[in-house]
């Protein structure tokens, strides 16, 4: 094996081209200059190297850049990106959206890998905030990306970026995440008129407070049951029967099918049965007539 470490005569690579796929592992190691490889990384992706050969090329780059690859190399990694570990990626400083897109393209069609998650984390931290262009890019590749962020990470999303969010991007968000996103969405869409505003804000309403739901009930929005069922229970409970009726419009009939599920179940328990009966839906479980309702939370606040 020792004599194999020298590059055979006439085999020294002058450029990165397809002839290299015929090089054995040790020949690639001995005959390809790491600096040449770094300057011609864009060619690697066009050459059908074997996985074993890609391992050798990665090793050469690792030796050349022990502190992490420069962005000029990162942008052209192509398939070699799939060889990188999260530890490798943590050494990188990626600032260009074009670089991010190029690497996400390589992973397209696959689930978000630890490598991709680390890359995105490095990129967003480097930018300081999740701007609209970045969010546009990330949600295009990974619709569930937004809901994978913690509430703390979501707090760095500027309201202007909310315009890039599609309803399906919020499908897997939990209430804590929507609590952070809703005020941003409210701010982003504040200049829109009633019906247009509702179309845009609808996906975010799982983070809306009671007062905003009361305001929406005055605007003939006809909220569908699927949206209503995603509302915060604590935001729905204080709504009156009249307000819920106005909020849902013709969809109010759907309450009957959902009467055993939250937040409808808990809301019914808080309403007077007389008021529920006015809906004509046969909803049961309200407060019987003649009972006095004590708001214990109010009592605690006063004490």
């Amino acid at each position: 094996e020792v004599e194999k470490t020298a590059c055979p005569s006439g085999k020294k690579a002058r450029e990165i081209d397809e002839s290299l796929i015929f090089y054995k592992k040790w020949e690639l190691e001995a005959c390809v200059d790491a600096a040449l490889l770094a300057t011609q990384m864009d060619r690697v992706n066009a050459i059908p190297f074997t996985y074993e050969q890609l391992d050798v090329l990665k090793h050469k780059l690792d030796e050349l850049y022990p502190q992490g690859y420069p962005e000029s190399v990162i942008q052209h990694l192509g398939y070699l990106f799939l060889k990188m570990s999260p530890e490798d990626i943590r050494k990188w400083n990626v600032t260009s959206l074009e670089t991010l897109k190029a690497l996400l393209e390589v992973n397209k069609g696959h689930e978000m890998s630890p490598q991709v998650a680390t890359l995105i984390d490095r990129f967003v931290k480097g930018r300081g905030q999740l701007d609209k262009d970045t969010l546009d890019t990330l949600t295009a590749f990974y619709p569930g990306y937004l809901c994978s962020l913690s509430p703390e990470e979501l707090s760095s999303v500027p309201p202007s970026s909310i315009w890039a969010v599609r309803p399906q991007d919020l499908d897997t968000c939990d209430p804590r995440q929507l609590d952070v996103l809703y005020p941003k969405a409210r701010l982003a869409f504040q200049n829109m008129n009633g019906s247009e505003y509702f179309v845009k804000i609808q996906s975010f309403l799982g983070g809306a407070p009671t007062e905003d739901l009361k305001a929406l009930s005055q605007q003939n929005v006809s909220m569908d049951l699927a949206t209503f069922m995603k509302l915060r229970t604590d935001a729905v409970l204080p709504l009156t029967v009249a307000e819920v009726q106005k909020l849902l419009g013709p969809h109010v009939e759907g309450l009957k099918a959902e009467e055993r599920h939250r937040p409808v179940r808990d809301w019914i328990l808080r309403q007077r049965q007389d008021d529920l009966d006015t809906l004509g839906l046969g909803l049961q479980g309200g407060i019987p007539n003649g009972y006095l309702v004590l708001d214990l939370s109010m009592q605690e606040a006063l004490s």
Partner: antibody, heavy 117, light 108 residues
Framework: SVEESGGRLVTPGTPLTLTCTVS????????MGWVRQAPGEGLEWIGT?????ITYYASWAKGRFTISKTSTTVDLKITSPTTEDTATYFC???????????????WGQGTLVTVSS | VFELTQTPSPVSAAVGGTVTIRCQAS??????LAWYQQKPGQPPKLLIY???ILASGVSSRFKGSGSGTEFTLTISDLECADAATYYC??????????FGGGTEVVVK
């Protein structure tokens, strides 16, 4: 889809060319391989042609086979068949663009070559 | 010379049972191994790639595992339709691009 043709009975030493016709994808995006299977035996990789036209052969197949391609076909030439080359020859698409050695995710039905005097 | 050795062959089990097929590589091929199913008169069908990733449309009863030099394919809840010959294939390097000898699965 992938479809092989050209298989027939030949006498030893008579060159034979098999053709693989592809549709629904581009040969400029996928490498293609040839695999054979002798009657009652296992699968044997012969060689692969890259998107750029580079050919790579199994060590036992070098000199015995030649792979070439056009925009929609991939040919396998058996230069001087012997009785040991009697087999069903499959054409198969490499499972991802950009690789020469990879798994095969789309196969033809195969074409039978019989070499006998 | 690189070799992929499959064991055992043939292997038989009853409907509803489980079979395990092994594939041993003579060199480290990391996780670059695929499994195929072939029935008489048909071309091979890809089941698993990269040692454990299920190919599109393949039943989750098929499970691949292993890395380096030792790999296994496990078929659980055996059905009559699983009777076939199974092949492993490595694709890490040019020198190790090869198929295993095949393992016949008989379902009783």
């Amino acid at each position: 889809s992938v479809e092989e043709s050209g298989g027939r009975l030949v006498t030893p030493g008579t060159p034979l060319t098999l053709t693989c016709t592809v549709s629904g994808f581009s040969l400029s995006s996928y490498a293609m391989g040839w695999v054979r299977q002798a009657p009652g035996e296992g699968l044997e990789w012969i060689g692969t042609i890259s998107t750029g036209g580079i050919t790579y052969y199994a060590s036992w197949a070098k000199g015995r086979f030649t792979i070439s391609k056009t925009s929609t076909t991939v040919d396998l030439k058996i230069t001087s068949p012997t009785t040991e080359d009697t087999a069903t020859y499959f054409c198969a698409r490499v499972g991802s663009s950009g690789y020469l050695f990879y798994f095969f995710n789309l196969w033809g039905q195969g074409t039978l070559v019989t070499v006998s005097s | 010379v690189f070799e992929l050795t499959q064991t055992p062959s043939p292997v038989s089990a009853a409907v509803g049972g489980t079979v395990t097929i092994r594939c041993q590589a003579s060199q480290n091929i990391k996780s670059y191994l695929a499994w195929y199913q072939q029935k008489p008169g048909q071309p091979p069908k890809l089941l698993i790639y990269e040692a454990s990733i299920l190919a599109s449309g393949v039943s989750s009863r098929f499970k691949g595992s292993g890395s380096g030099t030792e790999f296994t394919l496990t078929i659980s809840d055996l059905e009559c339709a699983d009777a076939a010959t199974y092949y492993c294939q490595s694709y890490y390097a040019a020198s190790s691009n090869a198929f295993g000898g095949g393992t016949e699965v008989v379902v009783k």
